[in-house]
C-alpha cells in the first residue's frame, strides 16, 4: 500500500523516526511511515526531489531553497505560541537613549544570537542586503558584515576569516573561556545573550525575537545582569527609519519569521500528509503517551523531526513556499542566499561602440587589479535591443539602459534592474518630472480631468515631456481614444487647438499648429526648431504665458527657468513662479515647487538590467565597491567609472552625470523602477503602434 518516507538527517533523528514509525504502525495510522537516512537537510531535499524520500520538516531558509531550487511545497506547519500562531518576529533592539535607526546601522556595534541563526543573522543580514543598505561583493557576506558594523558578537564566527571583527564584542564565560562559542559558554549567545550584549553596553543594537526584551526585563529574568533592566529603556527599529516601543513588534519588525513546515514534492497530496501527522499528534503529543512527537529529550538532542516547542501541527492552505514564508522573510532570504560556489566568475557587460569597448576593457583591468569580483568581461552588440536579446540568451549578463529601453527589456525580454544611476540635483536633463502647467486662475480653474476642449502647448512632436508622456497618459486614462491608431487626429480632436511643432508636417492635422506663431516675421510657423517661438520647453511655456494656450506640457524645471528674473527675454522678464500651478493626476492643483508629488510621470534614471536569475545583490555589490575606488571623477586609482572624456565619447557604460550607483531596493521589476505613471504613458503610446 501507500507509504510516506520521512527523511532523517542524523542518527538521533533516525532513531526517533523509527520510534515514531513503530508508534504509528501500532496505532493503526495509515499510510505507513518509513524512515530514510539523509546526511543533511540539503541532502534530504535532493532525495525528496529525486523521489527517494517524501517528507521532511525544514526551517524558513531551507523551505526557500527547497521551493525555489527543487519545486517542493510546504503542506503542514508547526504552531508554537497561541498568541503569534505559525510564526514569530525578528526585531532589532536599541537603547532608548541612543540615536540609532535602521538607516544608521553602519559603524555601530552589533549583537547577534549566533552565526546563521534565523533572527540573529539570516533575517537582519538578508534584510540589510535586500534593502540596499549593505552591499556584498562576491557573495562574501561575512566580510561585508564585518566591514559594515563597528565590531560585533556573532557566536560561532570564531572559525571564520573575520573573527577579529565578528567576535570583537564577545566575552565568553565568567572565566573568559569559550569566547565567541556558539554555545552557552559565550555569555552573549542566544536570544538572551544577544540582548545582554546590548543591555551591558557592549553593543548598540541586538537582533533578537519579539519576545526577548519582555522576557528579560522588568524583573522577569533570574540572572543578576537583567535584574534592574526596564523594558521601557529599549526600543525597536522599524523598517521605515522610525523607532517604536518594544511592545509594538507586530508593526515594527524586520520580518515575520515563518514556523518550520513539512515539505513534500509538488505532486504529493498535502492533505494525506496532514491526516497522517494529525492522527499522530492526536495520540502522541500529550504527556504520558508512549511516544512523544514533540520531544527529543529521550534521544539526548533537541528539535528532532519537529521543534520541541511545537504545540500542534496545522494544515497549510496555500501550498506554495512564497505564501508560507511571506514577503518580508522571502525578501530577506533573497538578500542572504548567495552561494560563492555558484557565483559565475565573470560578469559579461554589453558594449555598443568602439569607445565603449575601450572603456569597458579599462574597467575590467582596473577591477581585476583591485580584486573586485566577479570579473568584468566585455561583449559587443549592435544596439540596446541586441544587448537585450543576448542577455536573454545568456550570452551576456548586464547592460545600462535608458527608460524606454528598460521598458522593452522588462516587457519583451523579461529583464530586471540590478542597480540604478543617481544624478546630482543640478543634472535635471537626465532624470526629470513631466508636468502640466496652467495659469493660477481662481475664476476659470480646471483640472487634469477637464482638459478636453482646452488649448494645449507642447515642446514638439515626439518630445518626452511635451508629447510622449502627456499624450500617453491621456490615452491610458481613457480621455483620448484614437481610432485606427491615429493618435495625431485623436489629439487634434481632443484639444480645441494646440501648438505641437514638427519636422515633417505631411498629413499633420492643422489644429496641432493652430497656436504656433513662427519667428518674429511670422514665418516658419510650427517648425520643429527654435525658429518657432513656441518650440521646445521654453517655447511651450511661452505659449501659455502669452495666453495662446491654457496648459503647457513641460519639464519640472521649465517654470523656474523662465520666471523670477531667471530669463531676461522681454516675454519672461517680469514673470513670477507663484502665478502658475501644476495639474495633478488626482484632480488637484499644486504649487510649481511641488513637482515631485504632482506630475504626470518621472523620466527615470538609467538602470543596469540583467536576467531575473542573476543575483542582483552581487551586481550591486560589485558596482558599490568599484565606485568607492573609481566613482569620484577626481580619483587617483587609474580609472573613472562615470567619466567618458578619456575615450572621446559620452555616457559610455554609465551616464557621465552619474554621481553614484544605487541599489534598486524595492524596485525589483522594470515597472517598479520606471514607476507606474511612466509605464502607463509608454503603454498608452505603444498601444497605438499598429
Amino acid at each position: 500500500g501507500m507509504e510516506v518516507r520521512w527523511c532523517a538527517t542524523s542518527d538521533p533523528e533516525q532513531h526517533k523516526c523509527g520510534n515514531m514509525s513503530e508508534a504509528f504502525r501500532e496505532a493503526g495510522i495509515q499510510p505507513s511511515l518509513l524512515c530514510v537516512r539523509g546526511t543533511s537537510a540539503d541532502h534530504c531535499v535532493q532525495l525528496i526531489a529525486a523521489q527517494e524520500a517524501d517528507a521532511i520538516t525544514l526551517d524558513g531558509g531551507a523551505i526557500y531553497e527547497a521551493g525555489k531550487e527543487h519545486g517542493l511545497k510546504p503542506v503542514v506547519g508547526e504552531v508554537y505560541d497561541q498568541e503569534v500562531g505559525t510564526s514569530y518576529y525578528a526585531v532589532a533592539v536599541v537603547r532608548r537613549s541612543s540615536h540609532v535607526t535602521i538607516d544608521t546601522l553602519k559603524g555601530v556595534k552589533s549583537c547577534h544570537t549566533g552565526i546563521n541563526r534565523t533572527v540573529g543573522w539570516n533575517v537582519p543580514v538578508g534584510y540589510l542586503v535586500e534593502s540596499g543598505r549593505l552591499s556584498v561583493m562576491g557573495c562574501d557576506v561575512l566580510k561585508a558584515v564585518s566591514d559594515y558594523f563597528g565590531g560585533s558578537c556573532v557566536p560561532g564566527a570564531g572559525e571564520t576569516s573575520y573573527s577579529e571583527s565578528l567576535c570583537r564584542l564577545c566575552r565568553g564565560d565568567s572565566s573568559g573561556e569559550g569566547v565567541c562559542d556558539k554555545s552557552p559558554l559565550e555569555r552573549y549567545y542566544d536570544y538572551s545573550g544577544a540582548f545582554r550584549c546590548l543591555a551591558e553596553g557592549a553593543g548598540d543594537v541586538a537582533f533578537v525575537k519579539h519576545s526577548t526584551v519582555l522576557e528579560n526585563t522588568d524583573g522577569k529574568t533570574l540572572p543578576s545582569w537583567g535584574q534592574a533592566l526596564l523594558s521601557q529603556d529599549f526600543e525597536l527599529l522599524c523598517r521605515d527609519g522610525s523607532r517604536a516601543d518594544v511592545t509594538e513588534w507586530r508593526q515594527c519588525h524586520l520580518a515575520r519569521v515563518p514556523a518550520h513546515a513539512v515539505v513534500v514534492r509538488a505532486d504529493t497530496d498535502g492533505g494525506l500528509i496532514f491526516r497522517l501527522l494529525n492522527e499522530g499528534q492526536r495520540l502522541f503529543s500529550h504527556e504520558g503517551s508512549s511516544f512523544q512527537m514533540f520531544s527529543s529529550e529521550a534521544y539526548g538532542q533537541k528539535d528532532l523531526l519537529f521543534k520541541d516547542s511545537t504545540s500542534e501541527l496545522v494544515p497549510i492552505a496555500t501550498q506554495t513556499y512564497e505564501a508560507w514564508l511571506g514577503h518580508e522573510y522571502l525578501h530577506a532570504m533573497k538578500g542572504l542566499l548567495c552561494d560563492p560556489n555558484r557565483l559565475p566568475p565573470y560578469l559579461r557587460w554589453c558594449v555598443l561602440s568602439t569607445p565603449e569597448i575601450q572603456k569597458c576593457g579599462d574597467m575590467a583591468v582596473a577591477f581585476r587589479r583591485q580584486r573586485l569580483k566577479p570579473e568584468i568581461q566585455c561583449v559587443s552588440a549592435k544596439s540596446p535591443q541586441h544587448c537585450m536579446e543576448r542577455i536573454q540568451a545568456e550570452q551576456v549578463d548586464a547592460v545600462t539602459l535608458s527608460g524606454e529601453d528598460i521598458y522593452t527589456a522588462g516587457k519583451t525580454y523579461g529583464l530586471v534592474p540590478a542597480a540604478g544611476e543617481h544624478y546630482a540635483p543640478e543634472d535635471s536633463s537626465n532624470s526629470y518630472y513631466v508636468v502640466a502647467v496652467v495659469r493660477r486662475d481662481s475664476s476659470h480653474a480646471f483640472t487634469l480631468d477637464e482638459l478636453r476642449g482646452k488649448r494645449s502647448c507642447h515642446a514638439g512632436f515626439g518630445s518626452p515631456a511635451g508629447w510622449d508622456v502627456p499624450v500617453g497618459a491621456l490615452i491610458q486614462r481613457g480621455f483620448i481614444r484614437p481610432k485606427d491608431c491615429d493618435v495625431l487626429t485623436a489629439v487634434s480632436e481632443f484639444f480645441n487647438a494646440s501648438c505641437v511643432p514638427v519636422n515633417n508636417p505631411k498629413n499633420y492635422p492643422s489644429s496641432l499648429c493652430a497656436l504656433c506663431v513662427g519667428d518674429e516675421q511670422g514665418r516658419n510657423k510650427c517648425v520643429g526648431n527654435s525658429q518657432e517661438r513656441y518650440y521646445g520647453y521654453r517655447g511651450a511655456f511661452r505659449c501659455l504665458v502669452e495666453n495662446a494656450g491654457d496648459v503647457a506640457f513641460v519639464r519640472h524645471t521649465t517654470v523656474f527657468d523662465n520666471t523670477n528674473g531667471h530669463n531676461s527675454e522681454p516675454w519672461a522678464a517680469e514673470l513670477r513662479s507663484e502665478d502658475y500651478e501644476l495639474l495633478c493626476p488626482n484632480g488637484a492643483r499644486a504649487e510649481v515647487s511641488q513637482f515631485a508629488a504632482c506630475n504626470l510621470a518621472q523620466i527615470p534614471p538609467h538602470a543596469v538590467m540583467v536576467r531575473p536569475d542573476t543575483n542582483i545583490f552581487t551586481v550591486y555589490g560589485l558596482l558599490d565597491k568599484a565606485q568607492d575606488l573609481f566613482g569620484d571623477d577626481h580619483n587617483k586609482n587609474g580609472f573613472k567609472m562615470f567619466d567618458s572624456s578619456n575615450y572621446h565619447g559620452q555616457d559610455l557604460l554609465f551616464k557621465d552625470a552619474t554621481v553614484r550607483a544605487v541599489p534598486v531596493g524595492e524596485k525589483t521589476t522594470y515597472r517598479g523602477w520606471l514607476g507606474l505613471d511612466y509605464v502607463a504613458a509608454l503603454e498608452g503610446m505603444s498601444s497605438q503602434q499598429c
Epitope: 540635483p425 543640478e426 543634472d427 536633463s429 524645471t557 523656474f560 513662479s577
Partner: antibody, heavy 119, light 112 residues
Framework: QVQLQESGPGLVKPSETLSLTCTVS????????WNWIRQPPGKGLEYIGY???????YYNPSLKSRVTISRDTSKNQYSLKLSSVTAADTAVYYC?????????????WGQGTLVTVSS | DFVMTQSPLSLPVTLGQPASISCRAS???????????LHWYQQRPGQSPRLLIY???NRFSGVPDRFSGSGSGTDFTLKISRVEAEDVGVYYC?????????FGQGTKLEIK
Amino acid sequence: QVQLQESGPGLVKPSETLSLTCTVSGDSITSGYWNWIRQPPGKGLEYIGYISDSGITYYNPSLKSRVTISRDTSKNQYSLKLSSVTAADTAVYYCARRTLATYYAMDYWGQGTLVTVSS
Amino acid sequence: DFVMTQSPLSLPVTLGQPASISCRASQSLVASDGNTYLHWYQQRPGQSPRLLIYRVSNRFSGVPDRFSGSGSGTDFTLKISRVEAEDVGVYYCSQSTHVPPTFGQGTKLEIK
C-alpha cells in the same frame, strides 16, 4: 518661514562617532535636498553631503568612508554621523537646504553647532 | 579636486564706496543644461552663512540691490555698489555644477 536647527553633543572623544540631528520646520524633508556643511575654526566651508527627497544619499568622496546621513520623515529630521573622528574634525557643523527655486544653492542654513573632538 | 580661487583674500573698504570680489573656477561651470551653478554667500561675524546670489546673478529674496553678481565660464565677480557697515564679514563663492559642491577660500571684507 523655513528654519533648520542643529542639535547634538558639543564634545566627542577621538575615535568615537559624531552624531548630529537637524530639525526642519516650515518645509518637508520629502522635497528638496538636505545638506551638511562644516567649517573648522577660522577656516573655510567644506561640503559633507546630502540626503535627497527620495532618501538617496551623496557624500563628499574625501569623507565618504566615515559619513552616514539618514532621515526620519515622521519627525521631519535628518541626521549626520561621522565615525572615527580626530581633532581635524573639530568644526562648526551646519545643516542647509537646497531646492530648485534657487538652482540648488543653499538657501536656508541652521545656526550651526560647534563640535570639539578632544579626549 | 575642483578648485575655486577667490581674490583678494582681504578687502578693506571705505563706507559708501564700491567693492568687488573675484572668483575663478579651475574648469568651466556651464552645466549640460546650459545653467551656470555659481552662488555667493555672506557670513557675518559669529553667524551662519547666508545666500546672497544664486546662478551667477540672481539675488536671493531679501538681499539688498546694492549686491550684484556677474561672470561666465570660469570667471565671476560679486560687486557691492556702496558698502554699508552691516556688510562686514566673509564672502564665499561656491559652485555646484560639479560634484561635490565646493567653496572658495573666502574674502574678508572690513571697513577701513
